[in-house]
Interface confidence: low
């Protein structure tokens, strides 16, 4: 986690040191995207650019001064959501030769502005290039629980850039838009949002056709070119622009390192508390156990005699009962040897009542400080009780 | 073999629509995108769009954007192509041929459909 | 949208003669071009895809070859059935486009 980055984000639009955020687009040969990009203050010109590969140059594909590039004429729009403090480019059509780095900017100078770089591929639907190499399978302990987990038609975070393919893909006739800027029909484009599920429905990863997953889901997992902005794993392009308020911004950067690191922290914070219980049970039972034996070594010997050589261990590991053995903890008492004498009655030396109690069960912390999973603590049956036979 | 099946010829009068079938054989219909292409008697060819069999994602030419409709069935694995609105000027013939394949890889239009012919007549 | 010229309109050789047929894209179509031979009353076929690779069954006298906006289709020796209409067609940038064609007649 570069920290030390941050304030670089915070640096003036035309600062040279600025570190640009990158956003990955992945387009349907065919389809169109939403390139989405940080707006400025009001009142200055907007564009998007293309980098050129020789001269590295970014020429201008659209802007607010009603220019677009002769290529992309009839197929870009560009929406400003000052509320939202961001501006949409719409590119429609998308042809192979539209792969490239384009980058978002403010002011008049377009090389000088650069406000977001974003590289767009345009493929098949097919194969898209996060789908080359297989994805790292997050590690069980890392799923989110469940109030974390976020409807799958979340709207997507500021990363994940919206990808318009067909909406419906069922026999539903293909709405047409009246804007000359569009021709081609997503069947049918219900405010930009598409449920993909088709005649044959494909399987990539979970689904290629439904949502972008959970937001969080998409923090969680490394914005690599493999992975890039998908979450968009599945397919589906839903942009809701009105629940999109509280993410858009590009303070947004920052807000992921800080769930993350909250996340940790939790996380952090529950096993070092788990712990100090776990030490202060253990020492307490241990100073239980001492004044026991004390009591135990008075009550039980002769004034004169030498401690009994066959005293129970009892620091030896609990004994497992059955489910419905009794709380009170009536252990066995090992069965003396034929000849032996037989030893006073068995002393139940029980622990304080509430600690028997069947819902309050406890591991023998004092023999394993193994730390067994949440999921686990609720089920284990190792009832803690101490028999101490004389 | 590999090929596509075309519907037969059609004679529509002006204001009229035409829907032209395209049958796959030899290959699965969403395996393929399927192009549309026109050619008017002596004259060269013209591009009307495009349609993915697989999700139904369709683009179409500014020329017939608002007009035409490509769609398609696959369970009989059919696509078809529908002009609304005809006039003289669509009298044709009308091609359905396979496009980009499934794993991305774009050979060209490799199979082409036998031609449906439509006539636009009052 | 991308204009795609071919030349000649038409172009008399006789069999065995070397044929050369150009296509000029109005911009850049990369190497997003293919080359189509049509006889009278037939489908098109599809003989050279993406500027310079020949199609399944098409015979080595057919090579294509250019990138940017200008693309040649080569036709080394003809052969009698190599007679017919040729078309270019782009795929850059949409709409797809083809050339107004270049019919090959003998001579």
């Known amino acids: 986690m570069d920290f030390w980055l941050w304030p670089l984000y915070f640096l003036p639009v035309s600062g040279a040191l600025r570190i640009l955020p990158e956003v990955k687009v992945e387009g349907e040969l065919g389809g169109s995207v939403t390139i989405k990009c940080p707006l400025p203050e009001m009142h200055v010109r907007i564009y998007l650019c293309r980098e050129m590969a020789g001269s590295g140059t970014c020429g201008t594909v659209v802007s607010t001064t009603n220019f677009i590039k002769a290529e992309y004429k009839g197929r870009v729009t560009l929406k400003q959501y000052p509320r939202k403090n961001l501006f949409l480019v719409e590119v429609t059509q998308l042809t192979e030769s539209d792969s490239g780095v384009y980058a978002c900017g403010a002011g008049m100078n377009t090389d000088r502005g650069k406000t977001q770089k974003v590289t767009l591929n345009v493929h098949s639907e097919y194969e898209p290039s996060w789908e080359e190499q297989p994805m790292p399978e997050t590690p069980k302990w890392f799923h989110l629980p469940y109030l974390f987990q976020m409807p799958a038609y979340a709207s997507s975070s500021k990363f994940v850039t919206r990808v318009t393919t067909p909406a419906q893909r069922g026999k539903v006739p293909p709405v047409h838009h009246s804007s000359p800027t569009t021709q081609i029909t997503h069947r049918p484009r219900v405010s930009r949002a598409s449920s993909v599920a088709g005649d044959k429905p494909r399987t990539f990863l979970p689904s290629t056709t439904a949502s972008k997953i959970s937001a969080l889901e998409g923090l969680l997992k490394p914005q690599t070119p493999s992975y890039n902005h998908h979450t968009r794993l599945h397919r589906q392009r839903a942009l809701d622009y009105g629940s999109q308020s509280g993410r858009e911004g590009q303070g947004f950067h920052i807000l992921i390192p800080t769930i993350l690191g909250l996340f940790l922290l939790a996380l952090l914070g529950l096993v070092v508390k788990r712990a100090v219980e776990r030490r202060k049970a253990l020492s307490r039972r241990a100073r239980r156990l001492a004044v026991r034996m004390r009591a135990l070594e008075s009550s039980q010997r002769p004034r004169g005699s030498p401690r009994p050589r066959s005293q129970n261990n009892i620091y030896s590991a609990c004994p497992r009962r059955a489910r419905g053995a009794d709380a009170a903890g009536t252990g066995e008492a090992p069965v003396p040897g034929p000849g032996a004498p037989l030893p006073p009655a068995p002393l139940q030396v029980s622990e304080s009542p509430w600690l028997h109690a069947p819902s309050l069960k406890t591991s023998c912390e004092y023999v394993s400080l193994y730390h067994q999973p949440a999921a686990m603590m609720e089920d284990s049956d190792s009832d803690d009780y101490i028999n101490v036979p004389a | 073999q590999v090929q596509l099946v075309q519907s037969g010829a059609e004679v529509k009068k002006p204001g009229a629509s035409v829907k032209v079938s395209c049958k796959a054989s030899g290959y699965t219909l969403t395996s393929y995108d399927v192009n549309w292409v026109r050619q008017a008697t002596g004259q060269g060819l013209e591009w009307m769009g495009w349609?993915?069999?697989?999700?139904?994602?369709?683009g179409y030419a500014q020329k017939f954007q608002g007009r035409v409709t490509m769609t398609r069935n696959t369970s009989i694995g059919t696509a078809y192509m529908e002009l609304n609105s005809l006039t003289s000027d669509d009298t044709a013939v009308y091609y359905c041929a396979r496009g980009r394949s499934i794993i991305n890889h774009y050979y060209g239009l490799d199979v082409w459909g036998h031609g449906t012919t439509v006539t636009v007549s009052s | 949208e991308i204009v795609l010229t071919q030349s000649p309109a038409t172009l008399s050789l006789s069999p065995g003669e070397r044929a050369t047929l150009s296509c000029r894209a109005s911009?850049?179509?990369?190497?997003?071009l293919a080359w189509y031979q049509q006889k009278p009353g037939q489908a098109p076929r599809l003989l050279i895809y993406?500027?310079?690779n020949r199609a399944t069954g098409i015979p080595a006298r057919f090579s294509g070859s250019g990138s940017g906006t200008d693309f040649t289709l080569t036709i080394s020796s003809l052969e009698p059935e190599d007679f017919a209409v040729y078309y270019c067609q782009q795929r850059s940038n949409w709409p797809w486009t083809f050339g107004q064609g270049t019919k090959v007649e003998i001579k």
């Open positions: 911009q850049s179509v990369s190497s997003y």
């Open positions: 349609m993915n069999p697989n999700s139904g994602n369709t």
């Open positions: 993406d500027a310079s």
